[in-house]
Interface confidence: medium
C-alpha cells in the first residue's frame, strides 16, 4: 500500500517532466531556483529554467542521452553554479559550488535567507497590472511565482502553484469587470494574507523537520491527522503520516519536483480510500488536483466515533503497559497519541504532544521501578495542569482582546514581549507581536471547543517566525533557549519569561522619535506600524515604564500625528510639535 514505491527510472528528470507536465515542471523549477538564489534577477532565472526544460525534453525523447541519468540535485546544482555573479551577489554561498552532492545541496539549503534584503513588493495601479497581464500572461504569472518564492524560500511549492492559479483567475475575471479595482483588490488582499499564513505554517513544518528531526514531525502529524480523521484506523493514520512526512521532507529539502509529484499521489490515495479515512472528503475529492490537495489539507475534522471507551484500560489500568511499551516504544506512544488526539479535537496539537511526552517520561521512569503499575497508575492526573495552563492563558488573553480591540491588544503584546526580550530587533518585535495579536480576531470568536487548537497552534507558527529570524542574527540567550530546548514547549517557555532585569536600557536618540509629513499619506496599517515601532523603542529606552505612562505617551503621539496631518504646513508642524512631544515624553517617562 506504499504510495511512493516506484520503479527505478533511467532518467529522473524525464520521469518528473512526464509526471508533472511541462507547465508545472517549469513553474516548480522556477520556484526552486528563486528559493535558492533569492537575489538573482527574474530574467536570469527564466533563462536557467528554459535551459533546464529544454534539457528535460531531450531526456524525455531519449532517456539514455548524455547526462540524463544524473540526479536532479546534480543537474540543478550544476545549473545554479553557472551563474556568473554568484561570488559578488552571494559571497560565501559561492563556496557551495566547490562541493559534491549531497553536500552541495545541503550547503545551498543552509544559505536560504528567511529575511532577504529585498524591496517591499509595491502593488502597481490596477490598469497597469491588467495591461501587463494581457500583454504577456505567462511572464506575468512567472513573475508572481518568482517574487513570492524569493521572499519565502520555504513556501510549500505545490501550494504556491495553487496560489498562482487563483492569482491568474482573479486577473482573468477582474480585468474584464466594469470596476476592475473593486473586483481585483479584495482578491489580491486575500491572496496576500493567505499566502503569508501559508508560508509561516510551512516554515514551522520545515523547522520541525530540520531542527528537531523526523520523529518530531511524525508526532505532530499523528496528532493532527488523528484529530482530523478520528474514524480512521491507526494503521491508516500511520500510513498517511509516513507519506506526508516524505512529501514535506522533500519540499523542505528543496526537492520540489518529487514533493509535488508525491503530494499528488497522496491526494489520489486519500480520495481512493476516503471511506476508511473520513466522511468529510467527498467535496474535496471532486475538485481538480491543486484545489483537491489544498482542500484535503484544510478539511474540517470528521465526527468522532460514538462511544469511544476510556483510554485508561489500555494505557493505565492494563498490567501489560510496560510489556507493550518495551515491545515497540514509538509504536506504543504513537497509538497513545492517536487515541488521545482522536478524542480531543478541542486540544491544540502542541498540548497533545506535551501529554504524550509526559506519558513517555512516566513510562521510562515507572517501567524500571519495583512496582510499575503502582508508579504509573496516576499518570493521567499529571495531565490536568498541562491542560489548564493553555486554557487559562487563552481565556485571559481573549478577555483582554475583547476589551482592547486588535490594535491595542497588539500594543499590549508589544510591550510584554519587548520587556521579555528587549535585545531583539525592533522590526522583528513589531512583526511578531502584530502577528501574535492577530490571534484575537482569528480565534477568540470561536466557541470554547475550538479556541485552543486555533490559538495555541497559531501561536506556535508565529513564535517560529521569531525563532527563525532570531537564528539569523542571535542577540538573546533567552530567545535561543526557548527556541531550541523543546518544540512543543516554545509557547509556554516564552509565556513564562519575565522582564529581563539584565537589560541595560538603550540610549535615548531623538532621531528615533522624529516624524515627517510622509506619515500622513501612509495606509492605516503602515501608520500603525510606525506608532508600534515608536512604542517598542520607548520600552527599550525605559523598560520599567508603567502601562499608564506608555499609554499617556502613545495617546499624545496619536494626537500629534492627527494634528500635524491636518495642518496646512505639515512638515513645519512635525518639526516643531515633534520637538515638544519628545521633550514631554522624556519628562513623562523620566528619561
Amino acid at each position: 500500500r506504499g504510495v511512493f514505491r516506484r520503479d527505478a527510472h533511467k532518467s529522473e528528470v524525464a520521469h518528473r517532466f512526464k509526471d508533472l507536465g511541462e507547465e508545472n515542471f517549469k513553474a516548480l523549477v522556477l520556484i526552486a531556483f528563486a528559493q535558492y538564489l533569492q537575489q538573482c534577477p527574474f530574467e536570469d532565472h527564466v533563462k536557467l529554467v528554459n535551459e533546464v526544460t529544454e534539457f528535460a525534453k531531450t531526456c524525455v525523447a531519449d532517456e539514455s542521452a548524455e547526462n540524463c541519468d544524473k540526479s536532479l540535485h546534480t543537474l540543478f546544482g550544476d545549473k545554479l553554479c553557472t551563474v556568473a555573479t554568484l561570488r559578488e551577489t552571494y559571497g560565501e554561498m559561492a563556496d557551495c559550488c566547490a562541493k559534491q552532492e549531497p553536500e552541495r545541496n545541503e550547503c545551498f539549503l543552509q544559505h536560504k535567507d528567511d529575511n532577504p534584503n529585498l524591496p517591499r513588493l509595491v502593488r502597481p495601479e490596477v490598469d497597469v497590472m491588467c495591461t501587463a497581464f494581457h500583454d504577456n500572461e505567462e511572464t506575468f504569472l512567472k513573475k508572481y511565482l518568482y517574487e513570492i518564492a524569493r521572499r519565502h524560500p520555504y513556501f510549500y511549492a505545490p501550494e504556491l502553484l495553487f496560489f498562482a492559479k487563483r492569482y491568474k483567475a482573479a486577473f482573468t475575471e477582474c480585468c474584464q469587470a466594469a470596476d476592475k479595482a473593486a473586483c481585483l483588490l479584495p482578491k489580491l488582499d486575500e491572496l496576500r494574507d493567505e499566502g503569508k499564513a501559508s508560508s509561516a505554517k510551512q516554515r514551522l513544518k520545515c523547522a520541525s523537520l530540520q531542527k528537531f528531526g523526523e520523529r518530531a514531525f511524525k508526532a505532530w502529524a499523528v496528532a493532527r491527522l488523528s484529530q482530523r480523521f478520528p474514524k480512521a484506523e491507526f494503521a491508516e493514520v500511520s500510513k498517511l503520516v509516513t507519506d506526508l512526512t516524505k512529501v514535506h521532507t522533500e519540499c523542505c529539502h528543496g526537492d520540489l519536483l518529487e514533493c509535488a509529484d508525491d503530494r499528488a499521489d497522496l491526494a489520489k490515495y486519500i480520495c481512493e480510500n476516503q471511506d476508511s479515512i473520513s466522511s468529510k472528503l467527498k467535496e474535496c475529492c471532486e475538485k481538480p488536483l491543486l484545489e483537491k490537495s489544498h482542500c484535503i489539507a484544510e478539511v474540517e475534522n470528521d465526527e468522532m466515533p460514538a462511544d469511544l471507551p476510556s483510554l485508561a484500560a489500555d494505557f493505565v489500568e492494563s498490567k501489560d503497559v510496560c510489556k507493550n511499551y518495551a515491545e515497540a516504544k514509538d509504536v506504543f506512544l504513537g497509538m497513545f497519541l492517536y487515541e488521545y488526539a482522536r478524542r480531543h479535537p478541542d486540544y491544540s496539537v502542541v498540548l497533545l504532544l506535551r501529554l504524550a511526552k509526559t506519558y513517555e517520561t512516566t513510562l521510562e521512569k515507572c517501567c524500571a521501578a519495583a512496582d510499575p503499575h503502582e508508579c504509573y497508575a496516576k499518570v493521567f492526573d499529571e495531565f490536568k495542569p498541562l491542560v489548564e495552563e493553555p486554557q487559562n492563558l487563552i481565556k485571559q488573553n481573549c478577555e483582554l482582546f475583547e476589551q482592547l480591540g486588535e490594535y491595542k491588544f497588539q500594543n499590549a503584546l508589544l510591550v510584554r514581549y519587548t520587556k521579555k526580550v528587549p535585545q531583539v530587533s525592533t522590526p522583528t518585535l513589531v512583526e511578531v507581536s502584530r502577528n501574535l495579536g492577530k490571534v484575537g480576531s482569528k480565534c477568540c470568536k470561536h466557541p470554547e471547543a475550538k479556541r485552543m487548537p486555533c490559538a495555541e497552534d497559531y501561536l506556535s507558527v508565529v513564535l517560529n517566525q521569531l525563532c527563525v529570524l532570531h537564528e539569523k542574527t542571535p542577540v538573546s540567550d533567552r530567545v535561543t533557549k526557548c527556541c531550541t530546548e523543546s518544540l512543543v514547549n516554545r509557547r509556554p517557555c516564552f509565556s513564562a519569561l519575565e522582564v529581563d532585569e539584565t537589560y541595560v536600557p538603550k540610549e535615548f536618540n531623538a532621531e528615533t522619535f522624529t516624524f515627517h509629513a510622509d506619515i500622513c499619506t501612509l495606509s492605516e496599517k503602515e501608520r500603525q506600524i510606525k506608532k508600534q515601532t515608536a512604542l517598542v523603542e520607548l520600552v527599550k529606552h525605559k523598560p520599567k515604564a508603567t502601562k499608564e505612562q506608555l499609554k499617556a505617551v502613545m495617546d499624545d503621539f496619536a494626537a500629534f500625528v492627527e494634528k500635524c496631518c491636518k495642518a496646512d504646513d505639515k512638515e513645519t508642524c512635525f518639526a516643531e510639535e515633534g520637538k515638544k512631544l519628545v521633550a514631554a515624553s522624556q519628562a513623562a517617562l523620566g528619561l
Epitope: 484506523e233 491507526f234 494503521a235 500511520s238 462511544d307 469511544l308 471507551p309 484500560a313 489500555d314 501489560d320 510489556k323 507493550n324 515491545e327 515497540a328 509504536v331 506504543f332 504513537g334 497509538m335 492517536y338
Partner: nanobody, 128 residues
Framework: EVQLVESGGGLVHAGGSLRLSCAAS????????MGWFRQAPGKEREFVAA????????YYSDSVKGQFTISRDNAKNTVYLQMNSLKPEDTAVYYC?????????????????????WGQGTQVTVSS
C-alpha cells in the same frame, strides 16, 4: 499456551444465519486480540473480522461489513462471529485466531502474520 476450538459451522440456505463460536483455553485470554479468517476452496485465506481485548474495538473486511458481527465474552473465554444474510460466496472454512503483540493490533490487524495461535477451522456451506 492458548488453544482455540471453533464450533457452530454447518450447512445453511442463502439468506440464513449462523453463529460461530471460538473457545479458548488458558487464563490469559483477555490479553489477546481475536480474529476470524476464512479460506474458500482454491483461494487464499482472507481476513474477516477482529476484536480487541476489551471487545469495544473491532475491524471488518469490506466484504462482510454490516453483515457479520464479531464479539467476545472474556468471562467465558469465547469469541463469536454472528453471520447474517449469508450468500453462497460466504462458503469457506472459518478459522479463529489469537494475537498477543500489542502493536500488531494497531498496525496490521488484518494480516495473518499478526496472529500467534490458530484453531483447526469449522466448515460453513451456504447453498443457493
Amino acid at each position: 499456551e492458548v488453544q482455540l476450538v471453533e464450533s457452530g459451522g454447518g450447512l445453511v440456505h442463502a439468506g440464513g444465519s449462523l453463529r460461530l463460536s471460538c473457545a479458548a483455553s488458558g487464563p490469559t485470554f483477555s490479553n489477546y486480540f481475536m480474529g476470524w479468517f476464512r479460506q474458500a476452496p482454491g483461494k487464499e485465506r482472507e481476513f474477516v473480522a477482529a476484536v480487541k481485548w476489551s471487545g469495544y474495538h473491532t475491524y471488518y473486511s469490506d466484504s462482510v461489513k454490516g453483515q457479520f458481527t464479531i464479539s467476545r465474552d472474556n468471562a467465558k473465554n469465547t469469541v463469536y462471529l454472528q453471520m447474517n444474510s449469508l450468500k453462497p460466496e460466504d462458503t469457506a472454512v472459518y478459522y479463529c485466531a489469537a494475537g498477543g503483540t500489542f502493536s500488531n493490533w494497531y498496525t496490521r490487524p488484518r494480516s495473518g502474520d499478526s496472529y500467534d495461535h490458530w484453531g483447526q477451522g469449522t466448515q460453513v456451506t451456504v447453498s443457493s
